[in-house]
């Protein structure tokens, strides 16, 4: 979990800086005796592996790329995101409101821990490690953190249950503004995501080390209570569970009950009237659908490399070195994978939504609020040209599809 | 002034056992983490062990592993060697060394023959 | 185990010309606290080794201005600005980045 364990007695517990957000650098300690570290006096030191040194060096300089790239990146698409979101009425609507909350919660990262790492990276060692500033830092990297990946996970959660939602109550009319229960969810997901963060805020500590008769410090999770200890234990596991496979389960069992929903409402002149409502909206749930893909794909290497170095990777075998290459090589992907993701949500939108497309260039273009004829021509919230029932007063068919604006 | 002063060495033979001292003086013995290297006859310089500050710590090179015990005692500022099993190929002269981020103090040293 | 390799062996130089030793490492010596902890020492003949530049390029106290160390990664150089007859020995190179530390094979240095 982050540089340096213990002090004086490490000899297993150490985690070079697994934060979890992509930027962890939990290999570098964590699977071998780190050399900068002390170790027990009985001096089990194990035989060094080579290639660690080599994996290391190549990737603190690949990774200050690609964080930087995905600093600048993530910046501007995330912050462009939230700028087309705020400043567009119709744009205001469930889904984009769930899409701007993940946007905020990817800003909020990329703004604030990417730097941190990238220093941590660059400069080997804590910022600000002598100093009150420092131990805030240090606290406050893996919350943020933690509460990063909790928003983008239950972000992608909730529009999976909104895209279920969508389908499922057809009867419900609802204007342009974004409803209270995704205003209620957002609130809450944030507030979750805080929570589960909190013990990385308490088990992150400056902790004093030593190296050849100098000491250093660094920010660590350092264990102190019952609590604490447990969480470390089943960190890894905990992370996959609940940052990784259920917001597949969700998308999963969502998009099935969905599916069905649809495949019921087949037939019927109600399905005839709403086929282009309907399109648009199996659109929205494709974007969806594509969000969690990158999500899974970003994440899935980073998780696998944990989950292996948990159960197959033993640190006594004296042939460990090939599998220690192998997963260090596969952490760091996936490290830079998982910070990718951050990033990629606003480029995956511009490529999936031609309504987000047209706003980005637009908005990027400085103009998207004054471009009325884009506004007219293409409509922004996806089914805002209403299906009409002849009966003006029907609200069981007149569906506003605030919803479905995403395409 | 810092001065160290190894003593221990003499001759043993094969399999023997031996242990040598290096007394530190001049400085704070506590706050420096120490080493030991040996240089065979007409050889160049080979680093044997190191002990972290507090002596909880101790690292060995592979030649050595198993066989020699690096150690310390703070209360007399004194560092210790252990050398079991010994061969003819650790026949050296062993400096100690303080540790501050680099070796910047060493003893005059003491020469260990391993010799039936 | 990380091999420190030196070059050239022996040199032999004149009084007040520089002179230059090399060394490389088998692999980057960046240690992760970001130090890269590899040191000069001089063995006068007769005489324990003693430290002239230490983390790469700074000299330790009492070490004449003419020692300057340099280099990154895998390549680190000692440079004498003019040689006195007093820095004849032997050079050694030494990473203390990763267990085992490792010298190098040493670099004799004599006066013309």
């Known amino acids: 979990d982050n540089p340096e364990r213990y002090s004086t007695n490490l000899s297993n517990h150490v985690d070079d800086f697994t934060t979890f957000r992509g930027t962890e650098l939990s290999f570098l300690v964590t699977t071998h005796q780190p050399t900068n570290l002390v170790l027990p006096s009985n001096g089990s030191m194990h035989n060094y592996c080579p290639q660690q040194t080599k994996i290391t060096s190549a990737f603190k300089y690949i990774n200050t790329v690609i964080s930087c790239t995905i600093f600048i990146v993530g910046m501007v698409g995330n912050a462009t995101l939230l700028r087309i979101i705020y400043q567009n009425k119709c744009m205001r609507n469930g889904p984009n409101a769930l899409i701007a909350s993940l946007a905020l919660g990817d800003l909020i990262y990329v703004v604030i821990d990417l730097p941190i790492n990238v220093f941590k990276l660059l400069a080997g060692r804590w910022p600000f490690d002598h100093n009150d500033f420092g131990v805030f830092l240090c606290k406050l990297f893996p919350f943020l953190q933690k509460s990063s990946v909790g928003i983008t996970v239950l972000n992608l959660c909730a529009l999976s249950v909104d895209r279920y939602r969508a389908v499922a109550s057809w009867s419900r009319v609802q204007g342009i503004g974004i409803p209270l229960v995704t205003a209620i969810e957002i609130v809450s997901i944030w507030i979750l995501s805080f929570i589960l963060a909190i013990p990385e805020a308490i088990g992150f500590v400056m902790v004093p080390f030593e190296y050849r008769g100098e000491q250093h410090k660094t920010c660590m999770l350092n264990a102190t209570s019952k609590f604490m200890e447990f969480y470390q234990d089943v960190k890894d596991w905990w992370l996959f569970g609940f940052y990784f496979c259920m917001p597949l389960v969700c998308t999963a069992i969502f998009y099935t009950l969905m599916t069905c929903e649809m495949l019921n409402r087949r037939n019927g002149s109600l399905r005839i009237a709403l086929s282009e409502h309907l399109k648009q909206r199996r659109e929205v749930a494709k974007t969806v659908f594509c969000l969690v893909v990158i999500f899974a794909l970003c994440w899935f290497p980073l998780h696998l490399s944990r989950i292996l170095k948990k159960t197959v990777y033993n640190e006594m075998d004296k042939n460990r070195c090939e599998l220690l290459s192998f997963l260090l090589l596969m952490d760091y992907i996936g490290i830079n994978l998982a910070t990718m993701n951050s990033c990629i949500n606003p480029i995956a939108l511009y490529f999936v939504s031609k309504k987000f497309k047209n706003c980005f260039q637009s908005c990027l273009c400085c103009c998207c609020y004054q471009s009325k004829s884009l506004m007219t021509s293409v409509p922004m919230n996806g089914t805002s040209i209403q299906w009409k029932n002849h009966d003006q007063n029907n609200h069981n068919t007149d569906r506003s599809s605030h919803k479905d604006s995403m395409n | 002034e810092v001065q160290l002063l190894e003593s221990g060495g003499g001759l043993v033979q094969p399999g023997g056992s031996l242990r040598l001292s290096c007394a530190a003086s001049?400085?704070?013995?506590?706050?420096?983490?120490m080493s030991w290297v040996r240089q065979a006859p007409g050889k160049g310089l080979e680093w044997v062990s190191a002990?972290?500050?507090?002596?909880?710590?101790?690292y060995y090179a592979d030649s050595v592993k198993g066989r020699f015990t690096i150690s310390r005692d703070n209360s007399k500022n004194t560092l210790y060697l252990q050398m079991n099993s010994l061969r003819a190929e650790d026949t050296a002269v062993y400096y100690c060394?303080?540790?501050?981020?680099?070796?910047?103090?060493w003893g005059q040293g003491t020469l260990v023959t391993v010799s039936s | 185990d990380i091999v420190m390799t030196q070059t050239p062996l022996s040199l032999s130089v004149t009084p007040g010309q520089p002179a230059s030793i090399s060394c490389r490492s088998s692999?980057?010596?960046?240690?992760?606290?970001?130090?890269?902890?590899l040191e000069w020492y001089l063995q006068k003949p007769g005489q324990s080794p003693q430290l002239l530049i230490y983390?790469?390029?700074n000299r330790f106290s009492g070490v004449p201005d003419r020692f300057s160390g340099s280099g990154s990664g895998t390549d680190f150089t000692l440079k004498i600005s003019r040689v006195e007859a007093e820095d004849v020995g032997v050079y050694y190179c030494f990473q203390g980045s990763h267990f085992p530390f490792t010298f190098g094979q040493g670099t004799k240095v004599e006066i013309k």
């Open positions: 692999q980057n010596i960046v240690h992760s606290t970001g130090n890269t902890y």
């Open positions: 983390k790469v390029s």
């Open positions: 001049g400085f704070t013995f506590s706050s420096y983490g």
């Open positions: 060394a303080t540790e501050k981020g680099a070796m910047s103090h």
């Open positions: 002990i972290s500050t507090n002596g909880a710590t101790a």
